[in-house]
Every structure is written in C-alpha cells, then in structure tokens.
Interface confidence: low
C-alpha cells in the first residue's frame, strides 16, 4: 500500500525548490525498479515528484490566500512490467499560513452622529477590520483594536471595535472629532501587522443652552400717534444651540404686559416689540418693561439647563405729537324755546388742547345762519326760531388751535327747539255742507275736527262753540264731542231755499294751551231742495261738490 504523511507547504517560500514530503509504496525495496508519477492540477508546474524516490517538491512560491490546498493523484508503476504497483490514489497538499496580510477596514469611510453631552459608555459606532490570513492558524488573523487618536473623549473595545464615549463633549465647543482606530493582528504581539481607519464623529445638538440676551438694556421710542399693533423695535437673544434647539419665544413679564407685547419672528429669532394699547405722551411719556426669552422646544430631561430665563430691560420713550383739540363731551345737546329773541343763550361747549403747551381754542359752527358761537364756546341765537318750521338743528362744532390752525376737531351739536303755544287750533279742512229744505230739528248735518300746529306736552284738547251771533241765531246748534270733534245740528224744522239759500256759521275753536288760543272758523251750509225721497237736490250752486260725494243736478 501507499505510505505518506500529511503534506504541508508554507506559503510565500522564495526557494526554487522546497521539499514537501515523500510518496512511496511499501512494496518499494529501494532498488529503483518503481517509477512514481504525479497527476492533477499543479502537477509538473507547481509540484514535481522524483520518479525514483517519490519525493515531492514545490517549485513555485505559493499564496495561501489565493489557494489553500491542492488535490493531486499519485501513481506507482513497475518499470519492468509497466504495470501499476498500487492503485492510483488522491492526496492533499495544504498550504500553511504565514502572517503576510495586514488587517483592512472594508466599510470606509466611517461616519457617526452622536448627541452632545451623551454619558460615558454611549455607543457611537462599531468599526470592523478584516484579515485575509487564516483565522485557524495561530494568531495571524486575531485582531486587537486600539485608539491612536481621540482620547480622552472616545474609547474602543479591543476585541469588538465598538467605539464608545469616554468623556462628555459639548458641541458648542467642538462639533466634530476625527478618531483614528488601529487594528493589529497577532493580537498585538511582536511581528504583528496593522491597519488604520479614520472615523468622523459629529456631535448632534441637544438643547443644553438657553437663549441669552446680548444686551441688558434696550432703548426704543414710540410716537403717541402710533396705532395699536405698531412694531416699535426689535430685541435679540442668542442661543449657542442650533436648529430647533435655538428656536426661542420672547414674552413680557406679566406685570408689564398691559401696554406692550412681544411677538417672536421665528425666521430671524428676533423679538418684535408691539404696541398693545395706545400711549399718551401727556399721560405717561416713558415706560419700562422687562422681557424674557425661552427656548421653544425643551424636553423635560433638559430643563435643568433652562431653570432661569434670561431677561432684559426695555426703556420705551413716548414721542410727543401735536394733537387736535379735545372736546369735553363727544357731542352736545341743547334746548331753546321758539320765538326767543335774537342773541338768546343756547349753551356752552368746551374743548382743550391736550398737548402741554395748551394752545387757546377758537370755535365755529358749520352751515348755520341761526346760531353763533364765541371764543368762550358760548352759543347764542342769531335769528328768532320757529319750532313749527324746524324742531331740531343737527350742526357741527369745530374747535381749532390758535397756534396751529391745522389741528382741528369737530363734534356734533344737536339743538332742540322747544314749543310755545303760538298757534290757535283751526279746522282740519275746509268744510262746506248742505241742509234739506224739509230737514227736521236736531238733524246732524256735519262733523268737524280741528288741528293745532303747536306741540302739546299733554294731549291736545279743543273746545268748540258757536259765535255769540250764531248762538243767538237759532237755525243751527253745535255739540262738542269732547274728543276734539264736534257735530253741527239743525235747530229748527224746515228751511227755504228761496229766502235763505246759504248760511255762514262762525265756529270758535279754543286749545288747552297756556295761554289758551282761540280761532274763528266759518262753516258754509247750503239749503237744498231734496225732494220727497231726498235723493235729488236742487241748490243755488249747481256744481257744488257736497260732502256726501255727489253732484247736484
């Protein structure tokens, strides 16, 4: 049978021929009667065999990392007979490893992000090197990691390549670090090969800085004429953090927030001071407010960095503006009796200059020929007033500063003209009626009513009577209905168209005013021939339109 030991050949041997071992048959007695042959991949080129002795040689330098084993076949032949002495057999030549490969970091470039102020022990990233040498051959591929650059902030686990934080870092002092990691094979023993890699470690921001005002005092001005909502200036705080951690909100401390407000411009991170309520130079010409600033987003666990909000003081000076006169009242209402003589007193208006110089005021009444006003604001009548023509006057009073005639104010003035009893009552219309010749006594021939142009504090009440002459004339009589109407009745039976075709009755109407006024009003009564049926009339005036609503024939 075949006799051999396991064959090993070291890689990277530089000799032209390296003896590996011997193949032989146990039938070989050493008399050179057998011939050994080598077959298979590498036979004759990489490996040769001494045909007489069976010694095998490597004639090329080998690289285990390229090929770690060779499978060959061996034959042994009896030279005399040409026959095989042993059956053909396979055998293996293993290429043994030497430490000829340094560790290599394959996933470069390495970059990691870790929050600033992360505690010691926080995992940052794991770097991994690879060694092409045989991991089963001693320590050739056993790696040990170490930190060449990055102390004291980082550490690396020697066997895993895990990089951890070893000291808290503040992004605001330095926002990125280059860490250099070395991997050594042979677990760092002498003769080890090494490789290095660089890791860029960036610190992400956490909200560990509160915003702080750059200035402890701001001076702003605002005109007293500025409307509410006016921006009067900006204030600015600075935050060493970045992004949303630097977003801030400005506010005014509660006690100071009546007149001014601060809104935040989230694009510029400025605080805009806004006028919340109108200011008045003459009332208060300067203000002091305290503003504070806080971050917009603060997770609870970072509140320890934000316990005391930064504050600043804002002094606001109010600028004086020449203001128009100010009336004591928003409008005035006065009363005056009609028929009062020209120059009668109506009322007094008053306006003052709100500014400190207190300019004298001049007054005028617009669009009025009925009233006058003097420099003291006293209003008088310039004509006699008639309530029955105009009961109310809607006017405008203008006040102008003497020293600056552009400063003008106007307010409404309402004058009510009060009634006096200066009109007697009179017929509400012209009355003309008729009576039939054959009319009986007590027959109603007309109802009359009256009107009075005066205004009555109480209800108007009118009193109706016949004149003294007509009272003595017994043809007609009057009854006062006590409701501001009266009826005219016949006071006899029968009238004669030929003898007396028309009667003119004088009626007295008195009002209940003080003093009472009376008027005399004439009622015309025509005598008509009414016929038996009373449906046809013949009167003196054929075209007379009677109160009944039809014409005479």
């Amino acid at each position: 049978g075949w006799v051999w030991n396991q064959f090993f050949v070291p890689e990277e041997m530089n000799t032209t021929s390296h003896h590996i071992g011997q193949l032989r048959s146990d039938l070989d007695n050493g008399n050179n009667s057998f011939q050994y042959k080598l077959l298979g991949a590498g036979a004759g080129s990489t490996f040769i065999i001494d045909e007489r002795t069976g010694d095998i040689y490597a004639i090329q330098k080998l690289d285990r990392e390229e090929r770690s084993l060779y499978i060959l076949r061996a034959q042994v032949i009896d030279i005399a007979t040409g026959r095989a002495v042993e059956p053909e057999s396979e055998f293996v030549i293993k290429v043994s490893d030497i430490n000829d490969n340094e560790p290599k970091f394959l996933d470069e470039p390495y970059e990691a992000i870790v929050p600033e102020m992360s505690p010691e022990g926080t995992l940052v990233i794991q770097v991994t090197a690879s060694d092409a040498d045989d991991p089963s051959s001693g320590n050739n591929a056993r790696l040990l990691y170490s930190l060449l650059q990055g102390q004291p902030y980082f550490s690396v686990e020697p066997t895993t390549g895990v990089i951890r934080i070893s000291s808290k870092m503040d992004r605001e002092l330095q926002d990125e670090y280059w860490v250099i990691i070395q991997a050594k094979d042979m677990i760092g023993q002498p003769g080890a090969l090494s490789g290095t890699t660089s890791v860029l470690i960036k610190l992400s921001d956490v909200n560990d800085n509160k915003p702080i005002f750059k200035e402890s005092l701001y001076r702003l001005t605002v005109s007293e004429s500025a409307p509410t909502g006016t921006s009067i200036g900006t204030i600015m705080a600075y935050d060493n953090d970045i992004g949303e951690n630097a977003e801030m909100d400005y506010s005014i401390e509660e006690d100071d927030s009546q007149t001014f407000d601060i809104i935040t411009n989230h694009e510029t991170q400025e605080g805009i001071v806004i006028l919340k309520k109108k200011v008045d130079f003459e009332h208060q010409n300067h203000y002091g407010i305290r503003a504070k600033v806080k971050n917009h987003h603060v997770p609870e666990q970072l509140m320890k960095y934000h316990t005391e909000a930064s504050t600043t003081f804002i002094k606001i000076q109010v600028e004086d503006v020449d203001e128009p006169p100010l009336f004591l009242l928003p409008y005035y209402v006065f009363e005056v009796f009609e028929e009062t003589p020209q120059g009668s007193f109506v009322g007094v208006v008053s306006a003052t200059d709100p500014d400190n110089r207190k300019s004298p005021i001049r007054y005028s009444i617009t669009r009025s020929k009925v009233f006058n006003i003097n420099d003291n604001g006293t209003i008088t009548t310039s004509n006699s007033l008639d309530r029955e023509i105009s009961a109310w006057y809607n006017l405008s009073i203008t006040a102008t500063e003497k020293y600056n005639i552009e400063q003008i104010s106007s307010i409404p003035l309402y004058v009510q003209v009060l009634n006096i009893n200066d009109h007697a009552p009179e017929f509400s219309q012209y009355y003309e009626t008729y009576v039939c010749e054959n009319a009986g006594s007590g027959q109603v021939i007309q109802t009359i009513s009256a009107v009075d142009r005066d205004e009555s504090i109480e209800e108007h009440h009118f009193y109706f009577n016949l004149s003294v002459e007509d009272t003595n004339n017994s043809s007609f009589t009057i009854i006062d209905n006590q409701d501001n109407t009266a009826v005219i009745l016949t006071n006899r039976t029968g009238f004669n168209l030929q003898e007396e075709p028309v009667f003119y009755i004088s009626i007295l109407i008195a009002d209940n005013g003080i003093p009472s006024l009376t008027s005399t009003n004439t009622l015309t009564i025509h005598v008509c021939d009414c016929g038996d049926s009373g449906s046809t009339q013949t009167c003196q005036y054929q075209e007379l339109v009677l109160s009944m609503g039809f014409k005479t024939e």
Epitope: M117, P299, E300, Q301, L302, M303, K304, T307
Partner: antibody
Framework: QVQLQESGPGLVKPSQTLSLTCTVS??????????WSWIRQHPGKGLEWIGY???????FYNPSLKSRGAISVDTSKNQFSLKLTSVTAADTAVYYC????????????WGQGTMVTVSS | DIQMTQSPSSLSASVGDRVTITCRAS??????LNWYQQKPGKAPKSLIY???SLQSGVPSKFSGSGSGTDFTLTISSLQPEDIATYYC?????????FGGGTKVDIK
Amino acid sequence: QVQLQESGPGLVKPSQTLSLTCTVSGGSISSNDYYWSWIRQHPGKGLEWIGYIYYSGSTFYNPSLKSRGAISVDTSKNQFSLKLTSVTAADTAVYYCARGVYRTGAFDIWGQGTMVTVSS
Amino acid sequence: DIQMTQSPSSLSASVGDRVTITCRASQSISSYLNWYQQKPGKAPKSLIYAASSLQSGVPSKFSGSGSGTDFTLTISSLQPEDIATYYCQQSYSTPQAFGGGTKVDIK
C-alpha cells in the same frame, strides 16, 4: 445603592388631602442628574404619571389632576412629598415614588409603592 | 398631549419563543422611549431606556428598537420568570405618558 421608600396614611376620607413622603437613601436628592417623580396605579389598571420635581424646586404636573397636586422637596431631609387635595374614590391607587434620569427621562429606581384608599 | 398605544394588550407564548411587543406614539418622540417590567404585586422595573439601551443588570435577551413614533420590545427567548406586564413610557414631553401595558404569560 440608592433606595426609595414611600410613607403616609393608607386611608384618607373623601374631600380631604392625601399626603405622602418619599425618603431617598444611599444617595443625595440634590444631584443634577436626576429628578424625583410620583406615579400611581389604580387597582388592576396601568401607570399614571402624577408629576416630578427637581432638587431646585422646579415642578411639572399632569394636567389631569386639575391643580390638585403639589410636590415639594426637602433637601435637608433627603425627602420629597406629594399632596393631593379634594380626594375622591377615583384617587384610590398604589402610589409609587421614582427616580428619573435627566438625560433619558427613564425611571431607573422605584419605591415599592404604598396603597392609599379613599373612603369614608 | 402625547398618547402611547401598546399592542397587543395580552399574549401567550411558549417557553423559548421570541416575543415582540409594540408601542406607538401619537406624535414623534425621537428616541425618548423607555420600557418597564412589572410583576404582580411589585413595583415596575426599568428594562430599556432611550429606545434601545439596556438598563444595567438586565439580561441581554431583552432588546428595544425604533425611533420617531414606532417602537418594539423583544424578548429573544421567553422564560417562566418573564411572566409580567410590560409598559412603555414616553419622556419627550410632559405629561409623561405610559402605554396601557401588555400582559405576557406562558401557554
């Protein structure tokens, strides 16, 4: 080894004030790295955060308590306390005190809890 | 306020099984998510902080992952001593909120 221990009455009458104290041993309550919290658990239910306090006195509360809660700290005694006013039967629960880690907000150490019953 | 929703509310698994519990936040909470284990009659115990960091002394069979709104607690090989209720908790903003809990037992 930091330990937390709750103490206080186990029975409180309705409308009265519940008062609990948590004593911290094995470490200082004045540490910058922690805050001190109260958490409760109604019978058979989940956990409800009540509020917490920093050693400086800054407090945060759960709005669901509608301003009934007040947490205070006594650094000289290494204690912090909870007062809950106007209690009702709905406040019956196991009350835990716990230590919260600033950087993460995690409650890493808890007291064993104390059962408080609100009943007349 | 941020709401935390845990699922499932309860589960049964065999010894050695891999168990996964999920927790969802109603808005992004970055990595401010913590996991707790509570055994009957006991106080809760911290397992995981900052979404994935293992609390000191906790076995490595417990792991956490996720960020933003979706988070997971995994028990790689369930053992009888893991029977408990597990809670998630957000510490991003007040009021700090816990999930409703997941009760784990063994088939």
